[in-house]
Amino acid sequence: EVSADQVATVMWDYFSQLSNNAKEAVEHLQKSELTQQLNALFQDKLGEVNTYAGDLQKKLVPFATELHERLAKDSEKLKEEIGKELEELRARLLPHANEVSQKIGDNLRELQQRLEPYADQLRTQVSTQAEQLRRQLTPYAQRMERVLRENADSLQASLRPHADELKAKIDQNVEELKGRLTPYADEFKVKIDQTVEELRRSLAPYAQDTQEKLNHQLEGLTFQMKKNAEELKARISASAEELRQRLAPLAEDVRGNLRGNTEGLQKSLAELGGHLDQQVEEFRRRVEPYGENFNKALVQQMEQLRQKLGPHAGDVEGHLSFLEKDLRDKVNSFFSTFKEKESQDKTLSLPELEQQQEQQQEQQQEQVQMLAPLES
């Protein structure tokens, strides 16, 4: 099923890409290209019997193109508003600049202490799980070597069950590996929430009447940090997938050689164990530092907030994360409204349905226009 997150990512990546290019040059491509990218998401889904994907696609594309145009229009305005918000906030915090900086510093250290054990655990788990994966797969290679040594009468019939098993075991163990490692990213999210909440409480006395503005800035920080956690999850997942794609051919190679001569088979079985070890070790080396790098990125984001709120803030492109947050909120809201309607539609009569579809079109318009008004 196409998710709100996938749609928002396509839209945001597309928007960022446009922002980096000369706007005018790509103006005429905008609508059709975004539509193409969104339609591509639905490509695999449309063969399915249910009409859910088709209905969603019909309603989503106009909503998305309109939202995209609105984003482009509001980007500069938002940049100004965020700048103004920060100025007011800085002015309010200026008399307490040292205390504010110190509070953020304390919070930063607290965050590091909170996250360090998790990064260590993630590193240890990567190592443990990689070793487990290697231990789980090695016996299949050894069994095949043994069958080959004992030179059973019907080599193909005797080796093939092991090769088939290895094929499945690679997939199953990589799934297991993902299942063991990705929860760390979710754990990080909880720690982010706790840390930002504490920061909010410790800065509240200094913000006074600009509390709303401070909250808005902290929401932006939380969004950025959680986005990092999502990226961590995605990277772990992608690395595990890559491992699967590197291991799968090893099993296929053996299965391919079953049809050939014994020599080729001997060679491929002799190399199998070594290749398994090598690929797993490479995965371990690549993924072990992910936790530490993630921590560094969070610390850096907290440090940026300290600079933003400090007296010597330079020009920061901070509005983009607010814009992205807003986009994601809108798309999520569109999806949940669509899902609600979808479940209601199942129990509605045709005249009610037609009436409801008219209302839906009006609502879509409203949803796009609702680009979060900033507290000013």
Epitope: S158, P161, A168
Partner: antibody
């Protein structure tokens, strides 16, 4: 928990064909071999073949080649077995079974096929 | 194909007794043997694999042994709910093959 739900009993004419389904739930369907086993009335079990839903790879027992065709649909977590040119000899209970580490750790409830004119 | 022979079609036993069901492979299959239990009107259930490893949730009254060509499933302290057909299976070589089954009846 793992559950394999098979389609209902079938009564068909000789010469026709039939497609039996097995819907899996409670585990990652695409990364386990799905096997099919035949049990004739009052007799033992015979392995028909297996399919790997992840890529559609199949292994057949030579005895059933040309009789059984195995397919799988990842989007609905369902495995299918198509049996063709049916005769009264094909009357049996057919089971789907998940292969976990070589052996069949979970079985469907069975589908009874009766071929009769 | 490897033939798995279960010479006893029917075995009678009493509650509390010990019973041994045997299975012979037509060629060496190492320890690649499983045992399944099939109660009347039900699908088979895995009991033992790798000749002697009990599947999750199987009572320790069920024990498997053997290697090469001769295998045994022993049920200690037989219970009335053990009334069933028992099948051995080899998975050393394709096609995987089953024994013809042994029916356990409770006297």
């Amino acid at each position: 928990q793992v559950h394999l739900q098979q389609s209902g009993a079938e009564l068909v004419r000789p010469g026709s064909s039939v497609k039996i389904s097995c819907k899996a739930s409670g585990y990652a369907f695409s990364i386990y071999w799905m096997n099919w086993v035949r049990q004739r009335p009052g007799q033992g079990l015979e392995w028909i073949g297996q399919i790997y839903p992840g890529d559609g790879d199949t292994t057949y027992n030579g005895k059933f080649k040309g009789k059984a065709t195995l397919t799988a649909d990842k989007s609905s977590n369902t495995a299918y077995m198509h049996l063709s040119s049916l005769t009264s000899e094909d009357s049996a209970v057919f089971f789907c079974a998940r292969r976990g580490d070589y052996v069949y750790d979970y079985w469907g409830q069975g589908t009874t096929l009766t071929v009769s004119s | 194909d490897i033939v798995m022979t279960q010479s006893h079609k029917l075995m009678s036993t009493s509650v509390g007794d010990r019973v041994s069901i045997t299975c012979k492979a037509s060629q060496d299959v190492g320890t690649a043997v499983a045992w399944y239990q099939q109660k009347p009107g039900q699908s088979p259930k895995l009991l033992i694999y790798w000749a002697s490893t009990r599947h999750t949730g199987v009572p320790d009254r069920f024990t498997g042994s053997g290697s090469g060509t001769d295998f045994t499933l022993t049920i200690y302290n037989v219970q009335s709910e053990d009334l069933a057909d028992y099948f051995c299976q080899q998975y050393s070589t394709y096609p995987f093959t089953f024994g013809s089954g042994t029916k356990l009846e409770i006297k």
